[in-house]
Amino acid sequence: HKSSSQGQDRHMIRMRQLIDIVDQLKNYVNDLVPEFLPAPEDVETNCEWSAFSCFQKAQLKSANTGNNERIINVSIKKLKRKPPSTNAGRRQKHRLTCPSCDSYEKKPPKEFLERFKSLLQKMIHQHLSSRTHGSEDS
């Protein structure tokens, strides 16, 4: 259905944008509180959205040092913004078998951001691999 695939595309474009925000934050990793955070890795199929919400819930924080505090806080806020709802996301919400956030290995900000980026890339890869060829506006 065209409008639902367009909605999915818009959703994945949002994921694409999140990768750039993660990359931006990686530049300021020394200005983040060096706290260990749950960082899902090798997420099992159908638990991607659950893992995604774990990354969003994590308490990534600026160390409030230097003049990078504003850009860091804005970037973190954007990472936590809820993406538009999709059928895939709704379906996965009903899965009770996905690991809880606390069960994932905790990692410092650098590895946390790298794993977040890997998950986002995996979700985009799944989306683009599962649909017919054509542009995001087709």
Partner: antibody, heavy 116, light 107 residues
Framework: QVQLVQSGAEVKKPGASVKVSCKAS????????MHWVRQAPGQGLEWMGT????????IYSQNFKGRVTMTVDESTSTVYMELSSLRSEDTAVYYC?????????WGQGTLVTVSS | DIQLTQSPSSLSASVGDRVTITCRAS??????LNWYQQKPGKAVKLLIY???RLHSGVPSRFSGSGSGTDYTLTISSLQPEDFATYYC?????????FGGGTKVEIK
């Protein structure tokens, strides 16, 4: 259809600033980030940075940090790129490009010439 | 920054020829590789995104393949309107970077 229309050519003196505009139409303006890319005469493409039109969040290339400012006028669906402290090496064609999964639509380019 | 090395930098070919352009990244870019076409005085056009996805309106004679660090753009049967400069671009990591370009000229 998606269209990005840029402002006309500019001639500037070294040390001056230039502000290039890019007016978007044919899609939901705030759904897509806008990137800026430049191309010096006879050279390849160089990424300058990006802006999210929904909240003016920016990411700039380290090569231009401190000299480039990207802004948005949501009421006219226009993105602006201002480059300050111009030098002769900034002579180039400047492009805006909408970003979905890639830079899927580009403006026609704006030639900026820096000459004393 | 991720470096992209395109080869060849230029090539001469005839209408109907099969043309292959390669792009090598300095690190694994996980298929986040796009191809663009540029003609003098015209807007840059996206041809292929995410290694092999054809952008809307792009003729099927254009195709892309690759993985890891090595990627290829193929034009199966060169048409008169295909004489242009082609660029690869990685979307894996900021900053966005482009290859040096490949100019396809008429033999």
């Amino acid at each position: 259809q998606v269209q990005l229309v840029q402002s006309g050519a500019e001639v500037k003196k070294p040390g001056a600033s230039v502000k290039v505009s890019c007016k978007a139409s044919g899609y939901t303006f705030t759904d897509y980030w806008m990137h800026w890319v430049r191309q010096a005469p006879g050279q390849g493409l160089e990424w300058m940075g990006t802006i999210d039109p929904s909240d003016q969040y920016t990411i700039y290339s380290q090569n231009f940090k401190g000299r480039v400012t990207m802004t948005v006028d949501e009421s006219t669906s226009t993105v602006y790129m201002e480059l300050s402290s111009l030098r002769s090496e900034d002579t180039a064609v400047y492009y805006c490009a909408r970003y979905g999964f890639a830079m899927d639509y580009w403006g026609q380019g704006t030639l900026v010439t820096v000459s004393s | 920054d991720i470096q992209l090395t395109q080869s060849p930098s230029s090539l001469s070919a005839s209408v109907g020829d099969r043309v292959t352009i390669t792009c090598r990244a300095s690190q694994d870019i996980s298929n986040f590789l796009n191809w663009y076409q540029q003609k003098p005085g015209k807007a840059v056009k996206l041809l292929i995104y995410y290694t092999s996805r054809l952008h809307s309106g792009v003729p099927s004679r254009f195709s892309g393949s690759g993985s890891g660090t090595d990627y290829t753009l193929t034009i199966s049967s060169l048409q008169p309107e295909d004489f242009a400069t082609y660029y690869c671009q990685q979307g894996h990591t900021l900053p966005r970077t482009f290859g040096g370009g490949t100019k396809v000229e008429i033999k």
